[in-house]
Interface confidence: medium
């Protein structure tokens, strides 16, 4: 009876900086007692480690066991269905999980207004799980870039984009007043990682913020 159960159709990682989650799709017609076994292989150490014997969710947080991701050759994971004494064949992730698969994010964006300029400061992510020396700026030490999108309310110029090469930016508002909403998407010019747009931060600009100079 070893392989009567169908295998999970697909297994994949979804990762942000020190937030490494393995996902899988359920087997068809699973029962209430079906659970999933998760195993992990680190490239260079060619043996599978069992991580969870019986997960009843469809995802598993592997951050704690992949903390060296940013200094390693990467990982593969595999998942199989288990129901009592029966189990399926393993389904293995299609691709190597490496630093290239990590989606880049920012921690937050702080906005302030000074003399008709919107000044923005990008806060880098500071995940609790990250070892003290593994900061975003130490791992991605060169070629950090940020795409900035600004939406003005009201106004039909919804998006303006700028790529900046540092964590500070400024926008001259040219006498425009209203609410300005900003999103930031990080990238690293030398890498292929995807970036995720931050949540929108908004700031209101009224006439009081402009000073007249003769």
């Amino acid at each position: 009876h070893g392989t009567e159960l169908p295998s999970p159709p697909s297994v994949w990682f979804e990762a942000e900086f020190f937030h490494h989650i393995l996902h899988w799709t359920p087997i068809p017609n699973q029962s209430e007692s079906t659970c999933y076994e998760v195993a992990l292989l680190r490239y260079g150490i060619e043996s599978w480690n069992s991580i969870s014997n019986c997960s009843q969710t469809l995802s598993y947080d592997l951050t704690a066991v992949t903390l060296d991701l940013y200094h390693s050759n990467g990982y593969r994971a595999r998942v199989r269905a288990v129901d009592g004494s029966r189990h399926s064949n393993w389904t293995v992730t299609n691709t190597r999980f490496s630093v290239d698969e990590v989606t880049l994010t920012v921690g937050s964006v702080n906005l302030e207004i000074h003399n008709g300029f919107i000044l923005g400061k990008i806060q880098l992510p500071r995940p609790k799980m990250a070892p003290a020396n593994d900061t975003y700026e130490s791992i991605f030490s060169h070629f950090r870039e940020y795409e900035i999108a600004i939406r003005k309310v009201p106004g039909n110029f919804t998006f303006t984009h700028k790529k900046v090469k540092h964590e500070n930016f400024s926008l001259l508002t040219s006498g425009e007043v209203g609410e300005f909403c900003v999103q930031v998407k990080p990238s690293v010019a030398s890498r292929s990682n995807k970036g995720m747009w931050s949540k929108e931060e908004c700031i209101s600009l009224t006439r009081q913020y402009f000073t007249v100079t003769n």
Epitope: F157, K162, K165, L171, L172, T173, S174
Partner: nanobody, 127 residues
Framework: EVQLLESGGGLVQPGGSLRLSCAAS????????VGWFRQAPGKGREFVSA????????YFGDFVEGRFTISRDSSKNTLYLQMNSLRAEDTAVYYC????????????????????WGQGTLVTVSS
């Protein structure tokens, strides 16, 4: 004095693509923001996209929705607008324009900020 000459317009089916070019002569663009506006029949001029000549800043009107890409080739002193997934409502005369300065500023969304204009090239999106 800057002279701007647009090309690349024409008739295209909905969902199709066109690449507009704008060749500049008379002076280099090195400290300019350059862009595209459009004017549909019976309507006013509308901002489409702009780019600083050093390439670090691009601006887009909200209707663009990721369909258009602006770029420039400084060695050829030419500005480009790659337009994909074209719709009937993109039908318009497209004008190239140049403004002095390249501060990141909302002024470049305004027609009045641009000192130099081309004659325009007609884009018709129709089946």
């Amino acid at each position: 004095e800057v002279q701007l000459l647009e090309s690349g317009g024409g008739l295209v089916q909905p969902g199709g693509s066109l690449r507009l070019s704008c060749a500049a002569s008379g002076r280099t663009f090195s400290s300019h923001t350059v862009g595209w506006f459009r004017q549909a029949p019976g309507k006013g001029r509308e901002f489409v996209s702009a780019i600083t000549w050093n390439g670090d800043t691009t601006y887009f009107g909200d209707f663009v929705e990721g369909r258009f890409t602006i770029s420039r080739d400084s060695s050829k002193n030419t500005l480009y607008l790659q337009m994909n997934s074209l719709r009937a409502e993109d039908t318009a005369v497209y004008y190239c324009a140049a403004a002095t300065g390249q501060v990141w500023s909302l002024q470049y969304l305004r027609e009045s900020s641009y000192a130099y204009w081309g004659q325009g090239t007609l884009v018709t999106v129709s089946s």
